[in-house]
Structures are given as structure tokens and as C-alpha cells.
């Protein structure tokens, strides 16, 4: 059971300092940005972080939204991450869920974070180069020391 | 209680090849990996590689790469590791040990090799 | 390839000793670090995770700290079934590196 707490806004980076944006199409990309560009961007780089209590104990539980004309949510449905058209639920009814990520810091680093699926036990998010493309993806890892699975939460409230 | 069982000790000679099995035996949850590791006589431990279970992806030691193949049977639960072109500094005790998280109190997540086999004794000698 | 220097190679004590074995990592591994026990004949046994963490069934005379590069085995008090090599392990990146391993030898 998660049930819904605050929200923050918030900009995401990875560990090259490049900024998680959601593009015309609806893919979380990766880019290099300038903090006016990131800015100007606006508010495909600001990320609505909800906290949900956790009814097991397992790290912070959240969503990862954006609102551009309609809220989507960060789903890692079937292990493939894309942004759904739906606002975060107040509630819900079970211990897994799709949209639903621990964020945790990295042990002795408080500003570096990881993000593991409540669906999938050892997956977590992370920045995969993809042609010229920096993606966001879900990653069975088992390498926890790897710089692709952490990213640094900024505060924009 | 997850217990690994290996197969027996192994003879053999420069050049040749060897397989050492390592089967699974008790519940053991989704999520983990097969490790090999060696310790020679007289030197310590060596980490060779390991194996997912999941989709069979490996990743191997530098040093071992070109001789070395993890495999894994999955409806038997059992793995392999086989090593080519035997020298004589082969010679070693082999292990396989599961990898799976274990989890701190705030569920922070961290891999550990918990279970171990018994070991497998190979001596490679002309 | 990340080199985990571990120290003492070998040290000789007496039961009640308190002894302290360290491990020095070539680059920040966080606290993805693990200590195992081997002894003659036997499969190593996992003693400490996550650098600080007591295995469930391992004697609480058995303590780990450390975080980064520098990390640090101790047993408070020798107990006589302790003697045994000891090794740290890396799990942060592949490969996976341990240290060459503390023999503990009765004094």
C-alpha cells in the first residue's frame, strides 16, 4: 500500500551534469544544458516528485511526473520506460507498482541518488547513450558502484 | 537454506579443458547471479565472473576472458563454468557463490556473495 | 579496475586480543564492501556488508566501518575458532576485486 504525501518540483540530473527533459515526443532525454537553457525549457525539465508513504519500510517511495499540456508519470511497465498520461494516484492498493520508485541515496554521498523500481527487485533508472541520444531506461544492475544509475535531485520550490 | 553443491575434484593436463558443475539445492529467490572464484595454493581469492541467470549475460575477468564460459541450465539449477587451455597455475580450489542483495534498514541495496559451494579442486599437472 | 590494498598480510595475536585489519580501496566504492572469513579446507563465510552491516548468525565481537576508500575490519575480542584468513571484497564495479587477504595466526 502507497499512500500519497507532498510533492516537489524538482530537476534531475545524471552524473555528467546533463538534465533530464521530457522531448516532443514524450521520451525522458538527457541533454547538456545551461542553467538559462534549462530555464527556457521549461517545464519539460522541472519533474513533479511525489513521496508516498510506504506500508513496507523500503526507501522513499515516489512518482516522477511532469505537467507540460497534461500531467505524465514515469512508468516502468514491462521493464520499458515512458511517460503515461495520468496524475499520480492519492492511493494505491498494492506492495508493487509500476510508477512507483525507491529513491535512495548512495551510501556516504547524500546528494547522489538512485532510483530502484518497486516492481523490479535490482532495476533501477539510469542514462544509457543511444546513438547521439542520452536516455533514461530501466537497468537490471548489479554493478551499484556505476555512475549511470545515480543522479543528482535539485530542488526548484 | 540455499546450498550450492559442486562437482568432484579434477586431473587433468596442460592444454585441456575442464567443466566444474555447481547445482542449486533449497528455495532460492528470483534476482540473484552466479560468481566464480578461485584461490590458488598459497595466494588468495580471485574473482573470475559471473553469470545472470535471468538472460544469461556475463561478464568476466580480463585475465580469464578468452578461456573462460559460464553457463547455466535453469531447469536443472545448476551452473557451469568450463576453462580452456589449462596451465599449470590453473591449479586452484574453484568456487561458485550465489549474488543477490541484501538490504539495509532505510532498503538501501547491497550484492553479496552469501552461499558457497564446497569447492572444486582442479589440478592441471603433465 | 578498482585495487583493494589490504593489511596486515599476516599478524599473530592471542585469544582476548583485539585486532584490526584494513583495506584500502584505489577509488571510492562507497560502502560496497564486504568481509569474508576463510578457513583451511573450507568455502570463505560472508561476515560484513555494506562495510558495516553483521551478517545475521555472525559473533557481534565481529564489527566493519568505513566508507569511500579506507574501511576497516575489527574483532574486539580473538576468540580461538577466529583464526583464519580474512579477506575484503569490492562489489561497487566490475571486476569484482578483493584484497589479498590478513592470515591471523595464534601468537
Known amino acids: 500500500y502507497f499512500g500519497k504525501l507532498e510533492s516537489k518540483l524538482s530537476v534531475i540530473r545524471n552524473l555528467n551534469d546533463q538534465v533530464l527533459f521530457i522531448d516532443q515526443g514524450n521520451r525522458p532525454l538527457f541533454e547538456d544544458m545551461t542553467d538559462s537553457d534549462c530555464r527556457d525549457n521549461a517545464p519539460r525539465t522541472i519533474f513533479i516528485i511525489s513521496m508516498y508513504k510506504d506500508s513496507q519500510p523500503r526507501g522513499m517511495a515516489v512518482t516522477i511526473s511532469v505537467k507540460c499540456e497534461k500531467i505524465s508519470t514515469l512508468s516502468c511497465e514491462n521493464k520499458i520506460i515512458s511517460f503515461k498520461e495520468m496524475n499520480p494516484p492519492d492511493n494505491i492498493k498494492d506492495t508493487k507498482s509500476d510508477i512507483i520508485f525507491f529513491q535512495r541515496s548512495v551510501p556516504g554521498h547524500d546528494n547522489k541518488m538512485q532510483f530502484e523500481s518497486s516492481s523490479y527487485e535490482g532495476y533501477f533508472l539510469a542514462c544509457e547513450k543511444e546513438r547521439d541520444l542520452f536516455k533514461l531506461i530501466l537497468k537490471k544492475e548489479d554493478e551499484l558502484g556505476d555512475r549511470s544509475i545515480m543522479f543528482t535531485v535539485q530542488n526548484e520550490d | 537454506q540455499v546450498q550450492l553443491v559442486q562437482s568432484g575434484a579434477e586431473v587433468k593436463k596442460p592444454g585441456a579443458s575442464v567443466k566444474v558443475s555447481c547445482k542449486v539445492s533449497g528455495e532460492i529467490s528470483t534476482g540473484y547471479y552466479f560468481h566464480w572464484v578461485r584461490r590458488r595454493p598459497g595466494k588468495g581469492l580471485e574473482w573470475m565472473g559471473r553469470i545472470d541467470p535471468e538472460d544469461d549475460s556475463t561478464k568476466y575477468a580480463e585475465r580469464f576472458k578468452d578461456r573462460v564460459t559460464m553457463t547455466e541450465d535453469t531447469s536443472t539449477d545448476t551452473a557451469y563454468m568450463e576453462l580452456s587451455s589449462l596451465r599449470s597455475e590453473d591449479t586452484a580450489v574453484y568456487y561458485c557463490?550465489?549474488?543477490?542483495?541484501?538490504?539495509?534498514?532505510?532498503?538501501?541495496?547491497?550484492?553479496?556473495?552469501?552461499?558457497w559451494g564446497q569447492g572444486t579442486l582442479v589440478t592441471v599437472s603433465s | 579496475d578498482i585495487q583493494m590494498t589490504q593489511s596486515p598480510s599476516s599478524v599473530s595475536a592471542s585469544v582476548g586480543d583485539r585486532v584490526t585489519i584494513t583495506c584500502l580501496a584505489s577509488e571510492d566504492i562507497y560502502t560496497y564492501l564486504t568481509w569474508y572469513q576463510q578457513k583451511p579446507g573450507k568455502a570463505p563465510k560472508l561476515l560484513i556488508y555494506g562495510a558495516n552491516k553483521l551478517q545475521d548468525g555472525v559473533p557481534s565481537r565481529f564489527s566493519g566501518s568505513g566508507s569511500g576508500t579506507d574501511f576497516t575490519l575489527t574483532i574486539s575480542s580473538l576468540q580461538p575458532e577466529d583464526f583464519a584468513t580474512y579477506y575484503c571484497?569490492?562489489?561497487?564495479?566490475?571486476?569484482?576485486?578483493f584484497g589479498q587477504g590478513t592470515k591471523l595466526e595464534i601468537k
Open positions: 571484497l569490492q562489489g561497487s564495479k566490475f571486476p569484482l576485486t
Open positions: 557463490t550465489t549474488w543477490r542483495i541484501y538490504r539495509d534498514s532505510s532498503g538501501r541495496p547491497f550484492y553479496v556473495m552469501d552461499a
